[in-house]
């Protein structure tokens, strides 16, 4: 089973709430930073990241970044504060329970990013919004 990696310092002195006033606890997210990936032309992929982390701050959410260029494909999984840009983009879907990939314009590469706010939600990255997580034909991705 995956070890939950706890970040260096959690500051819970201030209670963090969401837009509905519900208390936010530190999220559990996949946190492998950047890894090579074989996830390509699929409706969804599993991260296959072996580190589940408790995010440093309660306001942080799970993020996944998929990038493809002429040389390789990478998948990045992290925790990040949605109030701050990531890779120069705002995390506009941070309240979503699912990680639904959206394409962003980056020169010289194909760049998709998603963010979400349920435990380990960046383990399953979804490229098609119609995708149903109960689909038995889920294609797994194996990291190199």
């Amino acid at each position: 089973t995956i070890p939950p990696h706890v970040q260096k310092s959690v500051n819970n002195d201030m209670i963090v709430t969401d837009n509905n006033g519900a208390v936010k606890f530190p999220q559990l997210c996949k946190f492998c930073d950047v890894r090579f990936s074989t996830c390509d032309n699929q409706k969804s992929c599993m991260s296959n990241c072996s580190i589940t982390s408790i995010c440093e701050k309660p306001q942080e959410v799970c993020v996944a970044v998929w990038r493809k260029n002429d040389e390789n494909i990478t998948l990045e999984t992290v925790c990040h504060d949605p109030k701050l840009p990531y890779h120069d983009f705002i995390l506009e879907d941070a309240a979503s329970p699912k990680c639904i990939m959206k394409e962003k314009k980056k020169p010289g590469e194909t760049f998709f990013m998603c963010s979400c706010s349920s435990d380990e939600c960046n383990d399953n990255i979804i490229f098609s919004e119609e995708y149903n997580t109960s689909n038995p034909d889920l294609l797994l991705v194996i990291f190199q």
Epitope: P3, S118, E120
Partner: antibody, heavy 116, light 107 residues
């Protein structure tokens, strides 16, 4: 105000069944993994099992002593966690705590007594 | 399963004393160790996570150290409200096992 309130404990005979409930409030229950931890009278803490989020498939893990006898489920529409305990043994007698998995929040516990 | 062994199982101390509790894992768990305090009839309270990080709201007289297999909880100056039972817990692998507890009593 965050609350985890367990209920359903009581006296049951060996071989019997019991279902515990944990009503959650004050946070978005559906977003979090949840677990059960128990404590036999005068003894230490023992992790029972966990359930992951429904959206990721609701997978469960269990400690060896309860595997095959206990099941964990959740109803996100009711913000409620359940522990179904079957084929109960005297050694299952304990206070059962509902917890936000891997994070510092616990309910007050409910006592389960298995005795003839 | 990873076995967690605490020592001592109980100790007597006076207010103002420095108290040290140790916890040993049966295999390396890196820094994936939590310390809990429990008072009679109450749910456990998290004191230290990730071996050395102080949970918010916990007094600074509590500190944790160690990595790998050997860990320590230290109370620098014991206060009346600190008399309780203390548990270590590894969160490196499932199941996340606890130590058997250390009861801190008034001398």
């Amino acid at each position: 105000q965050v609350q985890l309130v367990e209920s359903g404990g009581g006296l049951v005979e060996p071989g019997g069944s019991l279902r515990l409930s944990c009503a959650a409030s004050g946070f978005t229950f559906s977003n979090y993994w949840m677990s059960w931890v128990r404590q036999a009278p005068g003894k230490g803490l023992e992790w029972v099992g966990r359930i992951k989020t429904t959206i990721s498939g609701g997978a469960t893990d269990f400690a060896a002593p309860v595997k095959g006898r206990f099941t964990i489920s959740r109803d996100d529409s009711k913000n409620t966690l359940y522990l179904q305990m079957n084929s109960l043994k005297t050694e299952d007698t304990a206070v059962y705590y509902c917890t936000l998995d891997l994070r510092a929040y616990w309910g007050q516990g409910t006592l389960v007594t298995v005795s003839s | 399963d990873i076995q967690m062994t605490q020592s001592p199982s109980s100790l007597s101390a006076s207010v103002g004393d420095r108290v040290t509790i140790t916890c040993r894992a049966s295999q390396s768990i890196s820094s994936y160790l939590n310390w809990y305090q429990q008072k009679p009839g109450k749910a456990p309270k998290l004191l230290i996570y990730a071996a050395s990080s102080l949970q918010s709201g916990v007094p600074s007289r509590f500190s944790g150290s160690g990595s790998g297999t050997d860990f320590t909880l230290t109370i620098s100056s014991l206060q009346p409200e600190d008399f309780a039972t203390y548990y270590c817990q590894q969160s490196y692998s499932t199941p996340p096992t606890f130590g058997q507890g250390t009861k801190v009593e008034i001398k």
